[in-house]
Interface confidence: medium
């Protein structure tokens, strides 16, 4: 279907009876069928050959009788100022005028919303040659209009370095509303308010905006676009969407889901990475986030021991990383381990609980009753000590270290020993004569090696000597060593 | 500052017509509903209807379709609400009110009114 | 067509006591908003959207509500807020009917 604006077929004065045709699309000897590559040069029919085109710089005879008569002012004739039509429908339009035959290098242009129209746009330009005027029509053609074609368009052409322009042809492309605005989804506190916005445009306008709630009208009377609906608040889940409506129809807009925020579900797969005598690394994974990004995270510690008095530690950390290390744990005890995270609602109930153990720690005390005395030989020092009293929580003996650090005129020298679990006593070799021995010691559990004695000191004299007193730290552990010689 | 100044008080026989202005300046007058409202004397107060002067389109209270008709000219910023075949039922005050908010807001309240026109229907 | 009865129909206040009257709609609705109207002048618009100030309105008027029952609270009454006080209901349904208005004397 071809929207045709024809000119009235008006006799021009010097142009004998009306212009041929009405540019309708059957008319084949006037070549109206559009170019489809690039912007098309001026068509002519040359008037020695009727019906025979020709293309190429378009030059018109001059004529010499008449260079002396006054021309009349040149201008396009009056064409149809607006045309309105449906989307994808077919339109084509044209401008005419009358160029007296003494102007030459005439060419017309088409312009559209004062840009020229380059490219592959369908315009024809024809010319009716006569004795004393040649009629030219420029005609442009839209197949399938689109919105992207309202405007108004003219005709410029350029004769003798003067420009005529024609009136207006302004297009109006009308089809169904066209959202620029459409409703958002959102995540909305429970009965708080909230605005959602829709905006639609024609042609053709007015477009009246209808709200719609979970497919229920929610306004009866139709409101203008743009239309802001304020929902007073909601208490579940909605979803919305708007309809645009104008003379053309109806279009309806994306609904959108406006979800309630509600505290998180609680965090899930709560796991042990690593455990250590005095801290465990846990990840989870977290619950729904409630239609809210979650804030912080508590990971709840309980002593399972019975004879704990239950009370429950408790860490906040981020949200993110899902993982935590929990420290400041006793070592070999049992835990009950679990996490809830809150988000600007609240906080979710706690996940499910699981058992994590520590490993078992390293002493906590130093052996007691350390003494160090020089043996008769005087090639070895005899190291005696008692166990330490060691806490369940430092697991099993393994043995002790013992550390001998020699010291004469400008040496110092440590040596680590390791002995059984059983021992209570140990025999060194002098390392170093005229000198000074330091003796500490260390228990040991798989847990690792605990806190060393105060530090018990000997002098080994130069061979000779005759000292065979003992060095020795008093029971408890911890006054000053006695060096006896 | 936003005003709406109604045409003076009528005083018509029964079976009569009338036709009541309202003169809106000092904002876009095509791009806000203007309603009407009704009260007898002594009573409260009763919605008619509205129209947009944007296009024209109106929407009424059921219990006044073919009572009232509400028109508005764009160019003098005028609402107009005629009210035919009147009956001593319709001698009131007649206000006009502009709705509220964002012009495009579907909240409907009336932050503007006119001072009222007095209808009195008497033989 | 949503019915708003507003009570009491009549009350007195003394100067600087609080005052509340309510509303109640004949089905949930949107937002009430209301107007003061003395004699011989046009309503004016206090309360917008339930809660809203409209501008102008001194700070000691307020209002509340949501569903079915609202309410215009004065927090201090004064001489000048003796009037007849009507609520107008939102619901996205025209028409948009008022209550039958409370009259507010000052003792």
């Known amino acids: 279907a071809i929207t045709e604006a024809r000119e009235e077929a008006k006799p021009y004065p010097l142009f004998p009876g009306p212009l041929p045709g009405s540019l309708q699309t059957d008319h084949t000897s006037l070549l109206s069928l559009p170019h489809t590559s690039g912007y098309q040069p001026a068509l002519m029919f040359s008037p020695t050959q009727p019906g025979r085109p020709y293309t190429g710089n378009v030059a018109i005879p001059r004529v010499t009788s008449a260079g002396s008569k006054l021309l009349p002012p040149l201008a396009f004739k009056h064409t149809v100022g607006h045309i309105i039509l449906s989307e994808h429908k077919d339109v084509k339009f044209n401008c005419s005028i009358s160029v007296p035959n003494i102007y030459q290098d005439t060419t017309i242009s088409w312009w559209k919303d004062g840009k020229e129209l380059l490219g592959a746009h369908h315009a024809i330009t024809q010319f009716y040659p006569d004795d004393e005027v040649t009629a030219i029509i420029a005609s442009f053609s839209i197949t399938s209009v689109q919105r992207s074609d309202n405007g108004s368009y003219i005709c410029k052409m350029k004769i003798n370095n003067e420009e005529i322009v024609s009136d207006p042809i302004y297009i109006e492309v009308q089809g169904l509303p066209h959202f620029t605005k459409q409703p958002e989804s959102m995540n909305v506190t429970r009965n708080t308010a909230f605005n959602l916005t829709c905006q639609a445009v024609g042609p053709p306008e007015p477009v009246n905006i209808f709200w719609v709630q979970n497919s229920s009208r929610v306004n009866e009377q139709p409101e203008k676009s743009p239309s802001v609906l304020t929902v007073p608040g909601l208490t579940e889940m909605a979803v919305f969407s708007c309809e645009a409506h104008n003379d053309k129809g109806l279009t309806v807009s994306k609904g959108v889901q406006i979800n309630i925020k509600a505290i998180p579900s609680p965090p899930t797969e709560v796991s042990i990475h690593n455990s250590t005598a005095h801290s465990i690394l846990i990840s989870w994974v977290p619950g729904f986030d409630g239609y809210s990004p979650f804030r912080n995270c508590s990971v709840q510690v309980k002593e399972v021991d019975p004879l704990s008095n239950g009370s429950v530690m408790i860490f906040n950390t981020s949200a993110s990383p899902h993982m935590y290390q929990i420290k400041q744990l006793q070592a070999l005890a049992n835990y009950s381990i679990g996490v809830s995270c809150m988000n600007e609602i609240g906080w979710s109930a706690v996940s499910p609980w699981i058992l994590a153990s520590t490993t078992e720690g390293a002493p906590s005390v130093a052996p007691l009753n350390v003494t160090v005395f020089l043996n008769e030989s005087r090639d070895n020092v005899d190291i005696r000590w008692m166990k330490p009293l060691t806490k369940r929580q430092a697991g099993e003996l393994v043995g002790y270290r013992i550390s001998h650090v020699w010291q004469s005129a400008g040496i110092s020298k440590e040596l680590l020993e390791e002995v059984g679990q059983n021992n209570s006593r140990a025999q060194i070799s002098v390392q170093v004569h005229n000198a000074t021995c330091t003796v500490r010691i260390a228990a040991v559990t798989k847990g690792g090696v605990g806190p060393f004695s105060d530090p018990v000191k000997i002098f080994i004299p130069a061979h000779g000597w005759v000292d065979h007193a003992p060095s020795s730290t008093p029971a408890p552990g911890n006054a000053d060593p006695v060096l006896i010689i | 500052q936003v005003q709406l100044q109604q045409s003076g008080p009528e005083l018509v026989k029964p079976g009569a017509s009338v036709k009541i202005s309202c003169k809106a300046s000092?904002?876009?007058?095509?791009?806000?509903?203007m309603n009407w409202v009704k009260q007898r004397p002594g009573k409260g107060l009763e919605w008619i209807g509205r129209i947009y002067p944007g296009d024209g389109d109106t929407n009424y209270n059921g219990k006044f379709k073919g009572k009232a008709t509400l028109t508005a000219d764009k160019s003098s910023n005028t609402a107009y609400m005629q009210l035919n075949s009147l009956t001593s039922e319709d001698s009131a005050v007649y206000f006009c009110a502009r709705k509220g908010g964002y012009y495009y807001s579907i909240s409907n309240y009336f932050d503007y009114w006119g001072q009222g026109t007095t209808l009195t229907v008497s033989s | 067509q949503i019915v708003l009865t507003q009570s009491p129909a009549i009350m007195s206040a003394s100067p600087g006591v609080k005052v509340t009257m309510t509303c109640s709609a004949s089905?949930?609705?949107?937002?009430m908003h209301w107007y003061q109207q003395k004699p011989g002048s046009s309503p004016r618009l206090l309360i917008y959207d339930t809660s809203n100030l409209a501008s102008g309105v001194p700070v000691r008027f307020s209002g509340s509500g949501s569903g079915t029952s609202y309410s215009l609270t004065i927090s201090r009454m004064e001489a000048e807020d003796a009037a007849t006080y009507y609520c107008q209901q939102w619901s996205s349904y025209p028409p948009y009917t008022f209550g039958g208005g409370t009259k507010l004397e000052i003792k």
């Open positions: 000092d904002y876009e007058f095509s791009r806000s509903w």
């Open positions: 089905s949930s609705v949107s937002y």
